[in-house]
């Protein structure tokens, strides 16, 4: 009976995600058969989040909208380890929008999910950010410094990275 009700709950949770994510890849968390964590196929997973590299070229606003219709946000990078994971799936000759912007052009950077902007956990290329008209952040590769962040005009189309919490069923 307990297993039956658990299965029913799982099915109803899966139905919620079905519209945008017809297929999920799930792994068993720990030793308990009851706990499964899932990411939409073909998203990648790291710690408690799922990531998707969007290869369509869009402005920052539309990139965020694209993520949101999938139940995600543009990526918020919280640690060096997270960035190191993300860059494994990026192409060196492309740039990708992050969920970081400075809407007022006053160097008050903010993350899309309201995570406080912490200057100590930022990975700007040297000399960046450098322009008040460039109010959105990208991650890109520079041969001298490898992967880092740069500010760019928000209307210039770029690829992007979406991030969502893992789905627990």
């Amino acid at each position: 009976n307990f297993m039956y009700s658990k299965t029913v709950k799982r099915l109803s949770k899966l139905r919620e995600y079905q519209q945008y994510h017809p297929s999920l890849t799930c792994v068993m968390e720990g030793k308990d058969i009851e706990d499964w964590s899932c990411c939409p196929t073909p998203w990648t997973s790291f710690q408690s989040s799922c990531y998707f590299i969007s290869t369509g070229m869009q402005s920052w606003t539309k990139s965020q909208k694209n993520c949101s219709v999938m139940g995600a946000d543009l990526v918020v990078i919280n640690t060096r380890e997270e960035q190191d994971f993300i860059i494994q799936n990026l192409k060196r000759n492309s740039s990708y929008f992050l969920g970081l912007s400075d809407p007022g052009g006053r160097r008050h950077w903010q993350w899309v999910d309201q995570t406080p902007y912490n200057e100590n956990v930022t990975f700007w290329h040297s000399g960046e950010p450098n322009n008040l008209d460039e109010r959105c952040a990208i991650i890109n590769f520079r041969s001298s410094e490898e992967w880092g962040w740069n500010d760019i005009h928000c209307h210039v189309p770029q690829k992007s990275i979406c991030k969502m919490k893992k789905i627990y069923i």
Epitope: S59, T61, K62, D133, H153, H155, V156, P157
Partner: antibody, heavy 118, light 107 residues
Framework: QVQLVQSGAEVKKPGASVKVSCKAS????????IHWVRQAPGQGLEWMGT????????SYNQKFKGRVTMTRDTSTSTVYMELSSLRSEDTAVYYC???????????WGQGTLVTVSS | DIQMTQSPSSLSASVGDRVTITCRAS??????LAWYQQKPGKAPKLLLY???TLAEGVPSRFSGSGSGTDYTLTISSLQPEDFATYYC?????????FGGGTKVEIK
Amino acid sequence: QVQLVQSGAEVKKPGASVKVSCKASGYTFTSYIIHWVRQAPGQGLEWMGTIYPGGGDTSYNQKFKGRVTMTRDTSTSTVYMELSSLRSEDTAVYYCARMGDNEYFDYWGQGTLVTVSS
Amino acid sequence: DIQMTQSPSSLSASVGDRVTITCRASGNIHNYLAWYQQKPGKAPKLLLYDAETLAEGVPSRFSGSGSGTDYTLTISSLQPEDFATYYCQHFWSTPYTFGGGTKVEIK
């Protein structure tokens, strides 16, 4: 007032290159991105790509990749669109357009007719 | 790439008529759609953006509606200066493709 003034008509031979200019005035040049759109005679409109005058960042329509180059000169508030390896199908009016804050083309240049003929 | 299919390609109408032009996208463009008016020898002029927002200085007889993949431009009462070609354009992702155009002619 905002104005985009383009260079004059050009006649080119197949295989040659053409460089069209678009001089902006009436606003802060580096604050708005510029797009290029073309229109073949009696035909519809085709988006070619965009350039950000501040940093020089570009994004091109894959159809033209390798043949189109967009550049800018901030000292004269001018953007340029160069199209190489011209063929007769490139005969068209080429427009520059400014993308406004609402992310749509709010101001257009008057157009530059490029004729490719042997 | 998202394709934009506009219909009809041409129509004949009289002054005072109500005119409707439709634009269908090959994918969801989330209302990121503009409508332009173009007269011979001139650059296109922005009429509406975000599918239904009137651009500055555009008469209120022009209106837009739609969502997802299907959008409409309506001219409630056609005026002599409205005889022109109309184009839709999406701004969801590059390339920002245009519809094929609708030529509105005098009946």
